[in-house]
Amino acid sequence: VKMAETCPIFYDVFFAVANGNELLLDLSLTKVNATEPERTAMKKIQDCYVENGLISRVLDGLVMTTISSSKDCMGEAVQNTVEDLKLNTLGR
Amino acid sequence: EICPAVKRDVDLFLTGTPDEYVEQVAQYKALPVVLENARILKNCVDAKMTEEDKENALSVLDKIYTSPLC
């Protein structure tokens, strides 16, 4: 949950690509104003997930979730929260 | 803002070699089945996508990273 808060549109696009649903990918690409060549490129990536089946999609989703919730990312999120708190406190 | 580790993972998926990408994944999930899957996906993307396709995919990522929702 925390990871999606940091950049929701990224996870929107990533999971649309990885779950193989082209309709959701089309919607995600509209949200970022993707051009025709950009749409074509992203659909080629999605094709790889579709061709390699459900297990492939689950495993890569697991990788992304693991990286996003790793100390490398969570440490950063905590640091950002601390910085935000400092700024808010100073701003009062 | 997107976490740099996530950004690095995605950048290597598009622009790195299969070995570089799998090595990056291994830092977070060293299960053989996960690493084999990562290599299969990376090889597939390299086979399907032209350099221009990869530039366009990176352009989408750039739009994502500069979005107000990131």
Epitope: N21, E22, L24, L27, T30, R39, K43 | L69
Partner: antibody, heavy 115, light 107 residues
Framework: EVQLVESGGGLVQPGGSLRLSCAAS????????MHWVRQAPGKGLEWVSS????????DHADSVKGRFTISRDNSKNTLYLQMNSLRAEDTAVYYC????????WGQGTLVTVSS | DIQMTQSPSSLSASVGDRITITCRAS??????LAWFQQKPGKAPKSLIY???SLQSGVPSKFSGSGSGTDFTLTISSLQPEDFATYYC?????????FGPGTKVDIK
Amino acid sequence: EVQLVESGGGLVQPGGSLRLSCAASGFTFSTYAMHWVRQAPGKGLEWVSSISGRGRNSDHADSVKGRFTISRDNSKNTLYLQMNSLRAEDTAVYYCARTEYFHHWGQGTLVTVSS
Amino acid sequence: DIQMTQSPSSLSASVGDRITITCRASQDINNYLAWFQQKPGKAPKSLIYGASSLQSGVPSKFSGSGSGTDFTLTISSLQPEDFATYYCQQYSSYPFTFGPGTKVDIK
């Protein structure tokens, strides 16, 4: 210039079928999801169906699920809506539209379901 | 499903007036909101997408704002051709949903 032209509307009896078509031009048809939206006489707009760029996935409003099927033929740049088991409440002008915020619309085709 | 509500349902205004129409979503839709204008017997015309981005060819007297659940469409100086029905629509997620519309007529 993007152009969308619907056809296939008409008068049909309850329980009957109809197939609507939407001919598209002025853009790379297969790159975009396409959508059907309808408007009953004197009423507001209602989303009906959507289909992904290459036709891999689709979705339908609950009110038409199991009765309507959206499809596309990218070689003909044409979108379709197969409507079966039609009811009086399906009477409406049917529009096809491009992109999820419905940037471009066709002129609409009227479907009247009446005995 | 995300419900969209609009207020007012109708309003009477004069040429030159500044008017504001409000649209509310039943849950957070970020800025994934579009506005349309429709005249009787015609197809809807896209005015705004992304809550505030003006569609090409749409005059700058139209402006949109808001994010999350509350949005507004403003027409800065109403002209005779602006008397129509206005709809909002969310494209945050399927199923896409429209507001019930706001009819703007001449006072």
